[in-house]
Interface confidence: low
């Protein structure tokens, strides 16, 4: 029949060449002589000339070697045709296979490969992996089948076997433990790939392993005891700095330190912070220690790090003896700012009360009293009892030195320590009223005309507190009433001042005299400027001869 | 003698928030870490979480989200807040002090229990 | 996590007769450098809460009676009562104190046959 079984040609053949490789035949060369081609890429197209065939006797040539590598399967066609040209058969496949012949090494991908593993892992846990490729056939041939072992390590600590390699994956894992990076902290290891699966050409790479920190130390005191001074009510005040050594990688989250109080601190009068650089533990004084209450404090503080230890490991404790060194404190007034009530007006050397402080301090010191801020000069203090007195007239209505009916006075208290200390204290005095003003009307000066006037309002003020204001009245005297009429309006506090008769255009006192609801009396002169006019006037129309 | 009580609500729905206190008498309230462990009705013990002397505390992976153990001294309480709670978290409440402040005295180790309380999860 | 598990889950042993329960962790509770196993043992009655009967493996609690003992190490231990009680009959728990979070076993029912 006319067909051709795929024929196997190996690579990389010595010849001779041209070389008989099969025979193409058709049987209807019984009828007539028969011509032989062949067509297809290696044949009449490019690369042309691999193949030829004898044109009369149709054995198929191979001109030159082969490389499986570059062409690894070709595909022609066989034809036949009669003396006069005609096809006597179809167009006949022809498969050439390349069979592959070990002819290239094994190459890694990289000649170095890095990769890393936590210390201290288990035996079996995998690092990376490495690829070696070899390009010649895997799949029918072990030509290119690659098989990976591991040829050295470096260094040999804590032996010479710590890792292994997947033979065919190149998975390269932990077999033994003991990985420590505070020992070892790389491996270099020397990997081959070896081609036909162990048994053929060998080439060479490096992986290269970084043991990675974990935190398996942990943080120890050194010292583990301290002993401080603190003086008493300091805040914020550095007690001490707590050192601690850790054999981790240095400012890792394994190595960096975290200080916990776990005793000794009921009052939560301390704090502890990690200084960023050094390590450090920063133990301040959270709030003030009063010596008085507790002279020596015990502290305990345990550290661990930042990450989690990734075994079981002891904690360190560090034990710091604070003694609270003794202050001499400031006298303090009890209370800070003392109100008293007291009326207006008292006559001077009259006790107001007595305003002393408690000095903290366990010694008995001697208090002494004077008096710091005093604005108006109305008050004197005794520098031993702390009794003030009056010496100046209070008055309510003076706002200069009062608001809201509170006189405002600073007083000091001085110890005898050494050096002396002093507290101040607030004395509040609230001024209660007394009617000691009288109503007063306002504007004192008006204009009016004398046809017809205009009644004259004035406004009514009286610097007392109630009751000591209104109901206000009113009362002309020394005669003003004959031509004057006053009348107080309740409602709005205003006196309305009229014009009874005919005044002739001049300038005259009328004499007011206004009472409040306590009857304190204010006589007041109203200056009233009477001009020829008719109802309303602001001011008397020219020509005015004033006399 | 040290003595330790649960007390808090013994119903709580859905998605709400358990709120839980302890209180210790006989003893100062910040010597020793102060533990929370569940028991859900018939089943064993699930340890929540532990406050330390200093107030530091650590829990349970699988509450972390959701657990807030802390102290109010002034009271001698200790208080377990557990939120979005359902009804997986049915269980005896109990509150056990550790037996020591340090490692070396076994603080892991928990020799003072409350009596528990009884919360359950239902709408 | 560290996995306790208790053997058998239910117990049952006559007056006066030794019990025996088992405890088996998944990582070692032995820690070298203080040759400690960080582990306890708990009983448990109806209606109240765990007692403290065992610490560091064998460690008896003070109070707890002398036929209580604790024993094994790294990841198998054992609690054992040399002669049972009519007040024995509880649920005995261990628990791991040796890394976070502290985890019990699932507890063993001792009774009376």
């Known amino acids: 029949d006319w067909v051709v079984a795929p024929i196997s040609v190996p690579e990389n053949g010595k010849g001779p060449f041209p070389q008989r490789l099969n025979q193409l035949k058709s049987n209807k060369d019984r009828d007539t002589k028969i011509f032989y081609s062949i067509t297809g890429p290696g044949a009449d197209s490019p690369p042309e000339g691999v193949f030829a065939v004898e044109k009369e006797t149709g054995w198929l040539l191979l001109n030159k070697p082969l490389d499986r590598e570059e062409i690894a399967k070709y595909e022609l066609f066989g034809h036949a045709v009669s003396e006069n040209g005609a096809s006597v058969e179809d167009p006949m496949n022809i498969s050439i296979i390349v069979t592959d012949q070990n002819d290239h090494k094994p190459k890694f991908t990289q000649d170095t490969f890095r990769g890393s593993v936590l210390e201290g892992v288990l035996p079996g846990t995998s690092v990376m992996q490495v690829t070696a490729t070899d390009e010649d056939d895997a799949i029918h041939t072990y030509n290119g089948v690659v098989a990976y072992s591991i040829h050295s390590q470096e260094p040999k600590d804590p032996h010479d076997l710590m890792f292994t390699i997947h033979r065919s994956t190149g998975t390269i894992s932990v077999i033994s433990s003991g990985l420590d990076r505070e020992k070892v902290p790389e491996y270099t290891l020397t990997i081959q790939a070896t081609d036909m699966d162990g048994d053929g050409s060998t080439t060479t790479a490096v992986a290269v392993v970084e043991i990675l920190d974990a935190n398996d130390n942990a943080p120890v005191f050194d010292p583990q005891k301290y002993e401080s001074h603190v003086p008493e009510n300091a805040v914020g005040h550095e007690v001490q700095r707590l050192t601690v050594t850790d054999l981790d990688a240095p400012n890792s989250p394994a190595w960096r330190a975290t200080y916990l109080i776990v005793g000794g601190d009921d009052g939560d009068h301390f704090t502890i912070a990690t200084h960023p650089e050094s390590n450090q533990g920063i133990l301040t004084t959270r709030k003030g220690l009063d010596f008085e209450a507790k002279n020596q404090h015990t502290l305990y503080v345990e550290v661990t790090n930042e990450a989690p230890f990734v075994l079981k490991l002891p904690t360190s404790t560090a034990t710091i003896v604070v003694h609270v060194e003794d202050v001499n404190e400031a006298p303090v007034f009890v209370p800070p700012s003392k109100v008293v009530e007291v009326q207006e007006g008292i006559p001077t050397g009259e006790a107001v009360c007595v305003y002393t402080a408690k000095d903290p301090d366990k010694e008995n010191q001697k208090i002494s009293y004077r008096i710091l801020r005093d604005p108006a000069g109305w008050l004197a203090m005794d520098p031993d009892s702390g009794q003030v007195t009056v010496a100046g007239t209070l008055d309510r209505e003076d706002e200069r030195f009062v608001r809201n009916n509170i006189y405002e006075v600073m007083v000091l208290a001085v110890d005898n320590g050494s050096p002396p200390t002093t507290g101040t204290g607030t004395l509040l005095l609230t001024l209660i009223d007394v009617n000691d003003h009288g109503p007063v009307p306002e504007p004192r000066e008006i204009t009016i005309c004398n046809q017809s006037p205009e009644s004259q309002v004035l406004n009514i003020t009286d610097k007392d507190l109630s009751p000591h204001t209104s109901p206000f009245q009113a009362q002309l005297t020394d005669d003003s009433d004959i031509y004057w009429m006053a009348e107080v309006n309740e409602k709005d506090d205003t006196v309305v001042l009229s014009l009874k008769k005919f005044l002739k255009q001049d300038t005259y006192d009328v004499h007011l005299s206004l009472s409040d609801h306590g009857n304190k009396e204010q006589l007041t002169v109203i200056r009233a400027t009477v001009c020829d006019c008719h109802g309303h006037v602001e001011k008397c129309p020219d020509p005015w001869k004033g006399g | 003698q040290v003595q330790l009580q649960e007390s808090g609500p013994g119903l709580v729905k859905p998605s709400e928030t358990l709120s839980l206190t302890c209180t210790v008498s006989?003893?100062?309230?910040?010597?020793?870490?102060i533990n929370w462990i569940r028991q859900p009705p018939g089943k064993g013990l699930e340890w929540i979480g532990v406050i330390w002397t200093g107030g530091g505390t650590n829990y349970n992976p699988s509450l972390k989200s959701r657990v807030t153990i802390s102290v109010d001294t002034s009271k001698n309480q200790f208080s377990l807040k557990l939120s979005s709670v359902t009804a997986a978290d049915t269980a005896v409440y109990y509150c056990?002090?550790?037996?020591?402040?340090?490692?070396?005295?076994?603080?892991?180790?928990?020799?003072?229990w409350g009596q528990g309380t009884l919360v359950t999860v239902s709408s | 996590d560290i996995v306790m598990t208790q053997s058998p889950d239910s117990l049952a042993v006559s007056l006066g007769e030794r019990a025996t329960i088992n405890c088996k962790s998944s990582?070692?509770?032995?820690?070298?450098?203080?040759?400690?196993?960080?582990l306890a043992w708990y009983q448990q009655k109806p209606g109240q809460p765990p007692k403290l009967l065992i610490y560091w493996a064998s460690t008896r609690e003070s109070g707890v009676p002398d036929r209580f003992s604790g024993s094994g190490s790294g990841t198998d231990f054992t609690l054992t009562i040399s002669s049972l009680q009519a007040e024995d009959v509880a649920v005995y728990y261990c628990?791991?104190?040796?890394?976070?979070?502290?985890?019990f076993g699932q507890g063993t029912k001792l009774e009376i046959k």
């Open positions: 628990q791991q104190y040796y890394s976070y979070p502290y985890t």
């Open positions: 056990a002090r550790s037996r020591g402040v340090y490692d070396f005295d076994g603080r892991g180790a928990m020799d003072y």
């Open positions: 006989g003893g100062s309230i910040t010597s020793y870490p």
């Open positions: 990582q070692s509770l032995l820690y070298s450098s203080n040759q400690k196993n960080y």
